[in-house]
């Protein structure tokens, strides 16, 4: 039978520059002598020879003279390989072949790792910062392996995922330098932290920067937005109103105006250096350039989608700074419900029927109410399901199970809670036997 060769199941993790032991063992029979042993270590994939022991002798390293066996332990069945000064290029699978009279082999994985340095943080621009300025924060960490995972968060633990660009470059030794860039609009002050994780070592390196922008002594710009959410129908254009009071002699060259998504800090639209910098939001936004000088910083959002719903912040910086957030509530009216009956013919009083009320392409989720011909609510045996399509619009299907009386009217009301729009359909079932829909 075959010789049993044992290696660790889990990869051997080795730090770059250190020595690693790839364990391999076999069970020698009584009377075993090293003269009988053939031991070969090779790279599993390329079959390149790494080290061997044959004819009673260590044949030495065939792998950059960085490998060694444990000669004093071979006779006890220890065929482990020592790999010195581990490099990134060593990562992979090594196979240990043992042959005495019988033969056996097993492969062991080497996972190379190198810890990342404590990140350094740089800020651009890094002086004369004011609230409302857009800054680029770069987090750099060096000489790690394998590629890092990078996470950003603010000073209260809120993850920052919008406007992050991370690049990782390998040097000649295969070690990675990671550079992660976060673009943010400064508030009154803020802490931004970057965490660089080595996924193999589960080693975290983190740094943070706290930015306290200068405030001018004259106080903040008062920025005004509507308190109530702006309600916009899907597919239409919406105006997110924002205004400020320009001082006498104000010129647009002094104005920094930034619209961004409140939570993710994603840039939406900006006006800086005396000109409209355009839309950073799917080219669906516009300012009112002729009105800016009068303090109208409103934003036009075209062809509103469900995904646009949320809070938008209007930052205005002249010499001073101010900001305010306005909520966009997206809505879409529900279609007039269609009613179907199952079964829909040869109906008799006492039959149980299923009435389905379907209404389409509304937002947000609908409220559905059933009632009979006398206005009595029907709440038992109602099942309502709402499914969003790719655009986020809901199709609502509400199913009522009833036992027919001599005749009856059943009506379904589908309400859009934001628009307070009601769409209703009803079905009247009369006579016996009856069919649905009634024949002309």
């Amino acid at each position: 039978g075959a010789l049993e060769v044992q290696v660790p199941e889990d990869p051997v993790v080795a730090l770059v520059g250190t020595d690693a032991t790839l364990c391999c063992s076999f069970s020698p029979e009584p009377g075993f002598s090293l003269a009988q042993l053939n031991l070969i270590w090779q790279l599993t994939d390329t079959k390149q020879l790494v080290h061997s022991f044959a004819e009673g002798q260590d044949q030495g390293s065939a792998y950059a003279n960085r490998t060694a066996l444990f000669p004093d332990l071979l006779a006890q069945g220890n065929a482990s390989l020592r790999l010195q000064r581990v490099r990134v290029a060593d990562e992979g699978s090594f196979t240990c072949f043992v042959s005495i009279r019988d033969f056996g082999s097993a492969a062991v994985s080497l996972q190379v790792a190198a810890p990342y340095s404590k990140p350094s943080m740089t800020l651009e621009p890094n002086k004369d910062l004011r609230p409302g300025d857009t800054v680029t924060i770069t987090c750099s960490s060096y000489q790690g392996y394998p590629e890092a995972e990078v996470f950003w968060q603010d000073g209260q633990g809120v993850p920052l995922t919008g406007n992050v660009t991370t690049s990782q470059m390998a040097n000649e030794q295969g070690l990675f330098d990671v550079h992660s860039i976060l673009r943010v609009v400064l508030g009154a002050n803020g802490t931004y932290s970057c965490l660089v994780r080595n996924p193999v070592l589960q080693q975290d390196a983190h740094s943070s920067v706290t930015i306290t922008p200068q405030r001018s002594p004259t106080g903040a710009v008062e920025v005004q937005v509507p308190e109530d959410p702006v309600v916009a129908l899907v597919g239409t254009d919406a105006t997110l109103r924002c205004s400020f009071s320009p001082e006498p002699g104000f010129s647009l060259a002094q104005l920094n105006l930034i619209w961004q998504l409140t939570d993710t800090k994603q840039l939406v639209h900006s006006f800086t250096e005396g000109r409209d910098q355009g839309s950073a939001y799917a080219n669906r936004t516009a300012l009112f350039p002729d009105l800016l000088a009068q303090g109208n910083a409103s934003l036009r959002l075209q062809r509103v989608r469900v995904a646009d719903e949320g809070s938008f912040t209007c930052f205005v910086s002249i010499r001073d700074f101010g900001s305010a957030a306005v909520s966009l509530q997206v809505a879409a009216p529900y279609s007039k419900p269609s009613m179907t009956l199952e079964p829909n013919k040869d109906l008799r009083p006492g039959d149980t029927v299923t009435i389905t009320c379907s209404s389409y392409r509304g937002y947000p989720e609908a409220e559905v109410f059933w009632q009979d011909g006398q206005g009595v609510p029907l709440t038992g045996n109602v099942t309502t399901s709402q499914m969003a399509n790719e655009q986020g619009l809901f199709d609502v299907h509400s199913v009522l199970r009833v036992v027919l009386g001599a005749n009856g009217t059943y009506s379904c009301l589908v309400r859009n809670p934001v628009l307070q729009q009601d769409a209703h359909g009803s079905v009247t079932i009369t006579g016996q036997p009856m069919t649905f829909p009634p024949e002309a």
């Epitope: 995972e149 996470f151 968060q153 000073g155 209260q156 633990g157 809120v158 993850p159 995922t161 508030g187 802490t191 932290s193 965490l195 994780r197 996924p199 589960q202 975290d204 983190h206 943070s208 409140t262 939570d263 993710t264 809070s311 957030a325």
Partner: antibody
């Protein structure tokens, strides 16, 4: 002692709204975000959203967008959660919780005692 | 969204047993937190920042990580450990919890 004390149980009709309060004490209210988490009977924990009491920034789970409104009153150190268009599936215990810690590691270190909201016709 | 899947959902064990609860994330998370909840009570912080025990949590609790799999181990179950445990992440929006693992007395 750091504490979050929530308002009492509520029974509501379908289609109506409920507003739950969460009063903070023993720490600087504006220094930490307040989150709302609900738990339906026999079910797990479900995150609804958070508010930063200082900036009043909010973020909501997609499921609750358009139905939930989180507000905070700095003068009374109180956070509020209002849920509209109630349906029977909204019957649950609603918790407020403080997200605390130090950069870059944060967790819910203090929870309110929970407010039971029952939606029934 | 990052999904957190806990396994098992239910676990019956005896006092003195060694038990493990796994929380698998659908993608990498910056850190994982764990909470303990007993019936009729609010959740309590149990383990934060992947492997740090919250105040008052006994040292028989530990967490190990392999890739996106976080494993909570109780080395020797005590009567007060029977509860439901939830994992939680907020590396990216939305914040998510695992569905919970209920640890019951066998």
């Amino acid at each position: 002692e750091v504490q979050l004390v929530q308002s009492g149980a509520e029974v509501k009709k379908p289609g109506s709204s409920v507003k739950v309060s969460c009063k903070a004490s023993g720490y600087s209210f504006t220094s930490y975000t307040i989150h709302w988490v609900r738990q339906a009977p026999g079910q797990g924990l479900e995150w609804m959203g958070y508010i930063n009491p200082n900036s009043r920034n909010t973020d909501y789970a997609q499921k609750f967008q358009g139905r939930v409104t989180l507000t905070a009153d700095k003068s009374t150190s109180t956070a509020y959660m209002e849920l509209s268009s109630l349906r029977s599936e909204d019957t649950a215990v609603y918790y407020c919780a403080r997200y605390s810690g130090s950069t870059p590691y944060w967790y819910f270190d203090v929870w309110g005692q929970g407010t039971t909201v029952t939606v029934s016709s | 969204d990052i999904q957190l899947t806990q396994s098992p959902s239910f676990l019956s064990a005896s006092v003195g047993d060694r038990v493990t609860i796994t929380c698998r994330a659908s993608s990498s998370v910056s850190y994982m937190n764990w909470y303990q909840q007993k019936p009729g009570k609010s959740p309590k912080p149990w383990i934060y920042a992947t492997s740090n025990l919250a105040s008052g949590v006994p040292s028989r609790f530990s967490v190990s990580v392999s890739g996106t799999e976080h494993t909570l181990t109780i080395s020797s179950l005590q009567p007060e450990d029977f509860a439901t445990y939830y994992c939680q992440q907020w590396s990216s929006n939305p914040l998510t919890f695992g569905q919970g693992t209920k640890l019951e007395i066998k």
